[in-house]
């Protein structure tokens, strides 16, 4: 379970076509 103080931090994962990009890479979203 995520700690309460982590709630509003972006979470970063590897994905393809994410973060307004066409290729695969890291993407961080709140």
């Amino acid at each position: 379970r995520r700690r309460r103080r982590d709630t509003h931090f972006p979470i970063c994962i590897f994905c393809c076509g994410c973060c307004h990009r066409s290729k695969c890479g890291m993407c961080c979203k709140t």
């Epitope: 995520r2 700690r3 103080r5 982590d6 931090f9 972006p10 979470i11 970063c12 994962i13 590897f14 393809c16 973060c19 990009r21 290729k23 695969c24 890479g25 890291m26 993407c27 961080c28 979203k29």
Partner: antibody, heavy 121, light 107 residues
């Protein structure tokens, strides 16, 4: 200026532990993901671990998973690497590196000077 | 098991163009970065997101990435460019790959 300074390296026996530190200055530490990357003598670069903005959002290379723990203290602007059950193949210069700013931080834009870890009996 | 493959060494005459390649499975579908490491020094980012240069990196450094190959091109190579060069790409959240490195010699 932007700077990363590693410390804590040294000579350690196989099976023992060591904790590395990386002191950051010149930028808002809490706003960046941080990596550890190592380089065995005369060899190439090997990614070790990353910790993103949230303490819970961290990833490890298979070669160190279960033995190494990455953590950060944003109040001290410091990154850590706790290394347990050390092996001879862990011998390397260990660099801390800053992930790029922004929502797509693929690259490592600032590197420290490195700290040498030697695992030997 | 993925890996990134680079030629161990590349030689170039001063003022000429140096080309360093990095090959990997479907590398062109990922963003490639390049790092310069001079002897005894820490790596320095020279190219990110295939083609972008960080501030402070000379215009003679450029990159491309398609298919299975990323390429670092150094135009008008200078003696100060002599160094090891490493490519890097993400293959998963827990798999960041570096190439084995290419030693660039400026003859």
């Amino acid at each position: 200026q932007v700077q990363l300074v590693e410390s804590g390296g040294g000579v350690v026996q196989p099976g023992r532990s060591l904790r590395l530190s990386c002191a950051a200055s010149g930028f808002t530490f809490s706003s960046y993901g941080m990596h550890w990357v190592r380089q065995a003598p005369g060899k190439g670069l090997e990614w070790v671990a990353v910790i993103w903005y949230a303490e819970s959002n961290k990833y490890y290379a298979d070669s160190v998973k279960g033995r190494f723990t990455i953590s950060r203290d944003n109040s001290k602007n410091t990154l850590y690497l706790q290394m347990n059950s050390l092996r001879a193949e862990d011998t390397a210069v260990y660099y801390c590196a800053r992930a790029q700013e922004g929502i797509a931080p693929d690259a490592f834009d600032i590197w420290g000077q490195g700290t040498m870890v030697t695992v030997s009996s | 098991c993925y890996e990134l493959t680079q030629p161990p060494s590349v030689s170039v005459s001063p003022g000429q163009t140096a080309t360093i390649t990095c090959s990997g499975d479907k590398l062109g579908e990922r963003y490639a970065s390049w790092y310069q490491q001079r002897p005894g020094q820490s790596p320095v980012l020279v190219i990110y997101q295939d083609i972008k240069r960080p501030s402070g990196i000379p215009e003679r450094f450029s990159g491309s990435n398609s298919g299975n190959t990323a390429t670092l091109t150094i135009s008008g190579t200078q003696a100060m460019d002599e160094a090891d060069y490493f490519c890097q790409a993400w293959y998963s959240s827990t798999n960041v790959l570096f190439g084995g490195g290419t030693k660039l010699t400026v003859l």
